[in-house]
């Protein structure tokens, strides 16, 4: 609890607020108010947030800490940063997965689920933009493959297969009969 920080304190200021009878110094981040100060401009009795709870800011009135959020396993979320006394758990997606927001106006606190990133290699395409905040952006077909419909088709390995115009341009030879 301690003594007086400063003999002249302003109850309307940032550091001291009226709590109960007196103008008290608040609790630092990561601490909750156990009891208000017992003298003018004194220090409140503050205790560290218990495990799995936190308070991110200096506060004057919080008599309990907020419960740390649990990452939603059903939505394939993982903890990127574990909860501490001063910060909530930061949930996100594991490498190879991206955040798919569940609401149209997406902000940092919006509910989300994790989707596996497209594997451009498996689609025989170049990776244009690596997957992180959104899905992988795949580019043109890899060498030895040509565009056919929505996918990439392997260049024929023999003269028996047909090789349309796009194939010929990429694979370097014309269809043979």
């Amino acid at each position: 609890q301690g003594g007086t920080r400063s003999p002249r304190c302003d109850c309307a200021g940032d550091f001291h607020k009226k709590i109960g009878l007196f103008c008290c110094r608040g609790c630092p981040a990561g601490h909750y108010l156990k009891a208000p100060c017992t003298e003018p401009c004194g220090n409140s009795t503050c205790l560290v947030c218990p495990q799995d709870t936190f308070l991110a800011w200096e506060n004057h009135h919080n008599s309990e800490c907020a419960r740390c959020q649990a990452c939603d396993e059903q939505a394939s979320q993982v903890a990127l940063e574990n909860c501490s006394a001063v910060a909530d758990t930061r949930c996100g997606c594991k490498p190879g997965w991206f955040v798919e927001c569940q609401v149209s106006q997406c902000v940092s606190s919006s509910p989300f689920y994790c989707q596996p990133c497209l594997d451009c290699g498996a689609l025989h395409r170049h990776t244009r933009l690596l997957c992180s905040r959104r899905d992988t952006d795949c580019g043109t077909c890899l060498p030895g493959f040509y565009e056919h419909g929505d996918g990439c088709v392997s260049c024929p390995t023999s003269t028996l297969g047909s090789c349309p115009e796009r194939c010929a341009a990429v694979c370097g030879w014309r269809q043979m009969f």
Partner: antibody, heavy 123, light 111 residues
């Protein structure tokens, strides 16, 4: 005029409980902290409890902490003292008092008092 | 806690005389230039009555013969000319910090 009407005193066995009441009138009850002070027979005054005005935080000396509860009902302009696990040494006249705050110093003085109610704890 | 010691325990005087009652605190009750000390009067069978607040301010309705002085740890209640109704017990009380504490009282009796 300011009035503090007390009730609830009486004889109680050691280990028992009692609830004192103080009905306030003649002032804006919600604007004042309120206190209880006791006086053992033939002895001096002892502060027992205080409750703040707006946020109703409560304060006690070590002698009654964890045994006594101070509360207020702002809608009914009433102050209460719930006394549990009573001991022979709790025998006293109990006074409720209004705490007036002075200036910007957050400084209080008990400017109006009830007439008192006698609590006798028999062992 | 702040301990308040009053002296004398009993003061025997006659009406018309000057009474000087003392209260000493175990630590300073000063805050921001104000001494957080009160004086109360209590008559037999009655509740205490506030006489002086902030060491030297006379509560409204209290006769002018009552005055308070002092700062830091040493305080005095003075009654300039005693009236018959002034014979009672007087208590000092500090509001500097919790727990609030009272002196043990000075009994002012008729000589």
């Amino acid at each position: 005029q300011v009035q503090l009407q007390q009730s609830g005193g009486g004889l109680v066995q050691a280990g028992g409980s009692l609830r004192l009441s103080c009905a306030a009138s003649g002032f804006t009850f919600t604007s004042y902290a309120m206190s209880w002070v006791r006086q053992a027979p033939g002895k001096g005054l002892e502060w027992v409890a205080t409750i703040s005005d707006g946020d109703s935080y409560s304060y006690f000396p070590d002698s009654v902490k964890d045994r006594f509860i101070i509360s207020r009902d702002n809608a009914k302009n009433s102050l209460f003292l719930q006394m549990n696990s009573l001991r022979a040494e709790d025998t006293a006249v109990y006074y409720c008092a209004r705490d007036r705050i002075y200036g910007s110093v957050q400084y209080y003085a008990m400017d109006y008092w009830g007439r008192g109610t006698l609590v006798t704890v028999s062992s | 806690e702040i301990v308040l010691t009053q002296s004398p325990a009993t003061l025997s005087l006659s009406p018309g005389e000057r009474a000087t009652l003392s209260c000493r605190a175990s630590e300073s009750v000063e805050f921001s230039g104000t001494s957080l000390m009160q004086w109360y009067q209590q008559k037999p069978g009655q509740a205490p009555r506030l006489l002086i607040y902030a060491a030297s301010n006379v509560e409204s309705g209290i006769p002018a013969r009552f005055s308070g002085s002092g700062s830091g740890t040493d305080f005095t209640l003075t009654i300039s000319s005693l009236e018959p109704e002034d014979f009672a017990v007087y208590y000092c009380q500090q509001s500097r910090k919790l727990p609030y504490t009272f002196g043990q009282g000075t009994k002012l009796e008729i000589k």
